[in-house]
């Protein structure tokens, strides 16, 4: 009486249940009446991650220097490489496939959160009280400087993007 | 938890029929899928695979064995059974039931086992 | 039949020691070896299956690898426990059959 469904890690056919080949391995030949599956190994710079009956392996990834991409995790025979940006760079999607110069924050602007090698920059404006002269990927919003500690009075008001000018006091006439 | 016993004579005399049954708990032979598997270990030597039963009663034996082999199943009981006939003293082992959830292994769950001596 | 040789067929360490016991099969049997372990008097126990997948509940200090004839049986970090007889069974064809063991011993 043939079967008419498989367990775990086998699959139907030729009304037998044959073993899928394990991670790492591709399909050689179906199992028959009297010998199991023939599987083989991936070869290199190849994988198959699941147990299977895949008659070929899957190429790993390629990490193209030229897109601004780096090896972050280096394939093996089960599993595919992983790639990231280059420093100062982050990929332009979850898959990493290209990659994009992390976004400076312009003037006015400071940094909230530096970029990763998989998110870009996040900029906040400049509160009232703090400063941003420069394009930056890593500045933060500046405070500015309290003349009171210095024992200066405010000669030019501070904006979002410079700082305070402090002077002397007035000497009484 | 799946539990495997055999049961049967410990003393079998030369040239008679040894017989063994495994009672299976705590899954069903007529569910499907699994193979039930006996398998020897003789004194001092290694473990030799006697043959396996399908719950549709599909066998594989081991050509290799001398005396001739019967597996049978009772779906109804729970059980499945082995008979070498014209046992001889090279057949004293220590008999196991096993389960294996392929046609070709691995056993996943064994029986404690049971000691059968040929005696002449 | 395919045979299984398995060497050594006898080895002593101590608790802690890695260990590898290797089995050459006399052909190709793709990645279906299974690994057992036996104590005296007990039924063996399933460690290894399909060369290299852990059987559930198996602790991860044995591990298995190879492919095609050559089979390695590693346990990184020897207990008290792991003394036993070990053996490799190919599932590749009929008849199926088992490496002669290899005994762990205390040293």
């Known amino acids: 009486e043939p079967p008419t469904a498989c367990r775990e890690k086998q699959y139907l056919i030729n009304s037998q249940c044959c073993s899928l080949c394990q991670p790492g391995q591709k399909l050689v030949s179906d199992c028959t009446e009297f010998t199991e599956t023939e599987c083989l190994p991936c070869g290199e710079s190849e994988f198959l991650d699941t147990w299977n009956r895949e008659t070929h392996c899957h190429q790993h990834k390629y990490c193209d220097p030229n897109l601004g991409l780096r090896v972050q995790q280096k394939g093996t025979s089960e599993t595919d490489t992983i790639c990231t940006c280059e420093e100062g760079w982050h990929c332009t999607s979850e898959a990493c496939e290209s990659c994009v110069l992390h976004r400076s924050c312009s003037p006015g602007f400071g940094v909230k959160q530096i970029a990763t090698g998989v998110s870009d920059t996040i900029c906040e404006p400049c509160p009232v009280g703090f400063f941003s002269n420069v394009s930056s990927a890593f500045e933060k919003c500046h405070p500015w400087t309290s003349c009171e500690t210095k024992d200066l009075v405010v000669q030019q008001a501070g904006t979002n993007k410079t700082d305070v000018v402090c002077g002397p006091q007035d000497r009484l006439r | 938890e799946v539990h495997l016993v055999e049961s049967g004579p410990g003393l079998v005399k030369a040239s008679q029929t040894l017989s063994l049954t495994c009672t299976v708990s705590g899954d069903s032979i007529s569910s499907g899928g699994y193979y039930w598997t006996w398998i020897r270990h003789h004194p001092g030597r290694g473990l030799e695979w006697i043959g396996h039963i399908s719950y549709s009663g599909r066998t594989s034996y081991n050509p290799s064995l001398k005396s001739p082999i019967t597996i049978s199943v009772d779906t109804s009981k729970n059980q499945f059974s082995l008979r070498l006939s014209s046992v001889t003293a090279a057949d004293t082992a220590l008999y196991f039931c096993?389960?294996?959830?392929?046609?070709?292994?691995?056993?996943?769950?064994w029986g404690q086992g049971s000691l059968v001596t040929v005696s002449s | 039949d395919i045979r299984l040789t398995q060497s050594p067929s006898s080895v002593s360490a101590s608790v802690g020691d890695r260990v590898t016991i290797t089995c050459r099969a006399s052909q190709g049997i793709s990645s279906w070896l299974a690994w057992y372990q036996q104590k005296p008097g007990k039924a063996p126990k399933l460690l290894i299956y399909?060369?290299?997948s852990l059987q559930s509940g198996v602790p991860s200090r044995f591990s298995g690898s190879g492919s095609g004839t050559d089979f390695t049986l590693t346990i990184s970090s020897l207990q008290p426990e792991d003394f036993a007889t070990y053996y490799c069974?190919?599932?590749?064809?009929?008849?199926?059959?088992f490496g002669g063991g290899t005994k762990l011993e205390i040293k």
């Open positions: 399909a060369a290299s």
């Open positions: 069974q190919q599932a590749n064809s009929f008849p199926l059959t």
């Open positions: 096993a389960r294996a959830s392929t046609r070709f292994g691995p056993f996943d769950y």
